[in-house]
């Protein structure tokens, strides 16, 4: 490329006309401020191309950079673009006008910048000052560019004198932006909404002043755009939030909502997505199984838990035998329903120091205007077994009988065992089972009664012993799901002149025997 006159700097007179020519091996064009100028283009016979730019009636506003470049200059090397700077000294034009982009200079790091105050006359002396300040700052000036240096976050003006008048430039604002890596968080007021309700999502980025938010959402894909609102969040600068609000949601608004945040300075970006479900109407759904029969142990506390999903938030009621339950002032019952996630709930009924009377039919009902669900179960109060009586007798028939009576819930099992060697029993010798195929000749009769009022079973078992020829330790053991209890009696033969009986508690025995219940001999009777 060849420019005539060659420059690189020309000083032209105001009101004059001037012709510039650019030639090259391909079509060439004159540009100023990235705009093509009115010009005459030609092609010579020797296959050279030229463009003639005629500048007429020049004013100070024509001062600036002019470029000659190949017509399709994309990807061309810098030396395939020629620059010419023209000054048109004009006393009526002070500083050349700037657009807003030039007046506000944003930085992201400490770096050299240029305050672009330019004059039309290269002979003028230009000084830089803080806005409303008189002291000139020691910063180098280039008439074609302005003042270049490292500047603090302040506002600055340039001054010059044209003739006898002092002229000020516009103020230039230097401001350091806060930029950091981007970490986006997205949340929704609700991730489940009914049709007709609003969807409101928030996308938050912290620590950046230069961010662009872009939302992707189902409605956008169908060409229905929603204008997000950007605002500030919390009591902190640079917590910036973009809010996407979709009023009156439709079923088609279900899907993935993505917030993409970009920061153009360092080319950082991040995005987060959230799923929104629009339902036709509300719902309540039980999660997991709760058995139809539940258990609680007498005098212990028991919490019964039901897990369910619901939207919108439901009302939860508990009933016992069709009567509504509430938190009792005595603290015997506690009801609570808590939200463990947006649509998941746990409802708990806590019975404190369970009483027999609290057995019965329980129901939890969760409902709102669109749906309801209920769950019922029977609560059984388990009572640890107690041996209430162990007695020995000598009927006239000559046999000896031992009677054992006990209670508990659920129904207790009874185990009879005996030990001959009183000195070594039960620590050293295992007891032998009675009532079936033991070497003792014995018979067993067991009756079971259910007492409705106390809601427990009573077991009465009678052991008949045919031939007792030496003292025998007989033990009655009762067991159920929540415990065991035992008592012992010493049975002596008829022939002995004295009868010695001793009741021995479980603790005295100092060991646990592994015994098998002789259930096939039990006869159950319910009253």
């Amino acid at each position: 490329l060849v420019i005539t006159p060659p420059g690189p700097e020309l000083i032209l007179n105001v009101s004059s006309t001037f012709v510039l020519t650019c030639s090259g091996s391909a079509p060439v064009v004159w540009e100023r401020m990235s705009q093509e100028l009115p010009q005459e283009m030609a092609k010579a016979q020797d296959n050279t191309f030229s463009s003639v730019l005629t500048l007429t009636n020049l004013t100070g506003l024509d001062t600036g950079e002019y470029f000659c470049t190949y017509n399709d200059s994309r990807g061309l090397e810098p030396d395939e673009r020629k620059r010419l700077y023209i000054f048109v000294p004009d006393p009526t034009v002070g500083f050349l006008p700037n657009d807003a982009e030039e007046l506000f200079i944003f930085l992201t790091e400490i770096t050299e910048i240029t305050i672009p105050c330019r004059v039309t006359d290269p002979q003028l002396v230009v000084t830089l000052h803080e806005k409303k300040g008189d002291i000139a700052l020691p910063v180098p000036y280039d008439h074609q560019r302005g003042f270049s240096g490292i500047f603090e976050d302040r506002s600055y003006i340039c001054k010059t004198t044209i003739g006898d008048r002092e002229v000020d430039s516009d103020a230039y604002y230097v401001y350091r932006l806060q930029v950091s890596s981007i970490n986006v968080s997205v949340n929704a007021v609700q991730t489940v909404v009914r049709q007709g309700e609003n969807i409101t999502l928030m996308c938050i980025v912290i620590g950046n002043e230069v961010v662009n938010f872009e939302w992707m959402y189902p409605r956008k894909e169908s060409g229905r755009l929603v204008e997000p609102v950007t605002d500030f969040l919390l009591d902190m600068p640079y917590h910036i939030r973009s809010i996407l609000h979709i009023p009156s949601a439709e079923l088609e608004d279900s899907g993935t909502y993505t917030c993409n945040v970009t920061e153009s300075v360092n080319d950082h970006q991040d995005e987060k997505a959230i799923n929104i479900t629009v339902v036709e109407s509300g719902y309540v759904r039980l999660l997991g199984e709760v058995g139809a029969l539940q258990f609680a142990e007498l005098h212990r506390s028991r919490t019964l838990q039901v897990v369910f999903e619901a939207y919108p938030p439901p009302t939860v009621l508990w009933f016992k035998d069709n009567r509504t339950l509430g938190d009792s002032s005595a603290g015997e019952i506690a009801l609570s329903t808590r939200n463990v996630s947006e649509t998941r709930y746990v409802s708990e009924l806590t019975l404190v120091r369970v009483k027999v009377a609290e057995a019965g039919h329980y129901t939890m009902r969760a409902f709102h205007e669109d749906a309801e669900v209920q769950l019922s179960f029977q609560l059984q109060i388990n009572v640890p077994v107690r041996v209430l009586e162990l007695s020995e007798s000598h009927p006239d028939s000559g046999e000896q009988t031992v009677r054992c009576r006990g209670r508990g819930m659920p129904q207790p099992n009874i185990i009879w065992s005996a030990c001959r060697d009183l000195k070594r029993c039960p620590r050293e010798l295992p007891p032998m089972l009675l009532g079936n195929s033991s070497e003792e000749e014995s018979q067993l009769e067991t009756n079971v009664t259910y007492w409705e009022e106390e809601q427990e079973f009573e077991v009465v078992s009678t052991l008949r012993l045919q031939h007792v020829d030496r003292p025998l330790s007989v033990r009655c053991t009762l067991r159920n799901a929540v415990g065991q209890d035992m008592q012992e009696v010493i049975v002596v033969p008829h022939s002995l002149p004295f009868k010695e009986q001793k009741l021995i508690s479980e603790e005295d025995l100092g060991g646990e025997q592994k015994l098998i219940s002789e259930e096939d001999l039990h006869h159950h009777h319910h009253h």
């Epitope: 662009n212 917590h239 910036i240």
Partner: antibody
Amino acid sequence: EVQLVQSGGSLVQPGGSLRLSCTASGFTFSSYWMSWVRQAPGKGLEWVANIQQDESEKYYVDSVKGRFSISRDNAKKSLYLQMNSLRAEDTAVYFCARDLVPPRQGDYYHYFGMDVWGQGTLVTVSS
Amino acid sequence: AIRMTQSPSTLSASVGDRVTITCRASQSISDWLAWYQQKPGKAPNLLIYKASSLESGVPSRFSGSGSGTEFTLTISGLQPDDFATYYCQQYNSYSRTFGQGTKLEIK
């Protein structure tokens, strides 16, 4: 010298109209947002309206929406406020001001305040 | 609209005193807050922008602080020229709102 000179204030009847003018000098008017601010007698300042450099964005306080219109002529370095359907409560001294709103950096604007103000012009709405 | 509440409404002080005026926003405005001084019959004068940046030509005894919803203007070492009315002003989403003003008078 950077300055804003106002004109157009007067006494007007309720329901009447008035146009206020504000002429800039000493700075590149076309590079700045501009605002109108008013002050009722003995009261505080109330922002009324603002306008972007090329008139592509205009904003108003709720109480004047639909009645007032802000405009500008960059060639004449002038800002205007057309006031229609005036009410007694519009009585105030009206100020024009240069509003330092830089071009957008990302999705929101920065702000540096109103640094140059006109001398004010009194609008009295009374029958 | 964002509401700006200044306190106190009136403040009596003496030359040389250090005074503080508070401004609260009804919602977070980051640090987009300016402070102005106005004398009777005059246009307001910008003192502070961006909550804490001192406008050129304003004496260094004026300072601003705060972000989010709570802001303060402090004048350390009151001068006779400082007795005036002070206004805070927020900028957010294109609109502006002024506080109701604090009149600083001589005690």
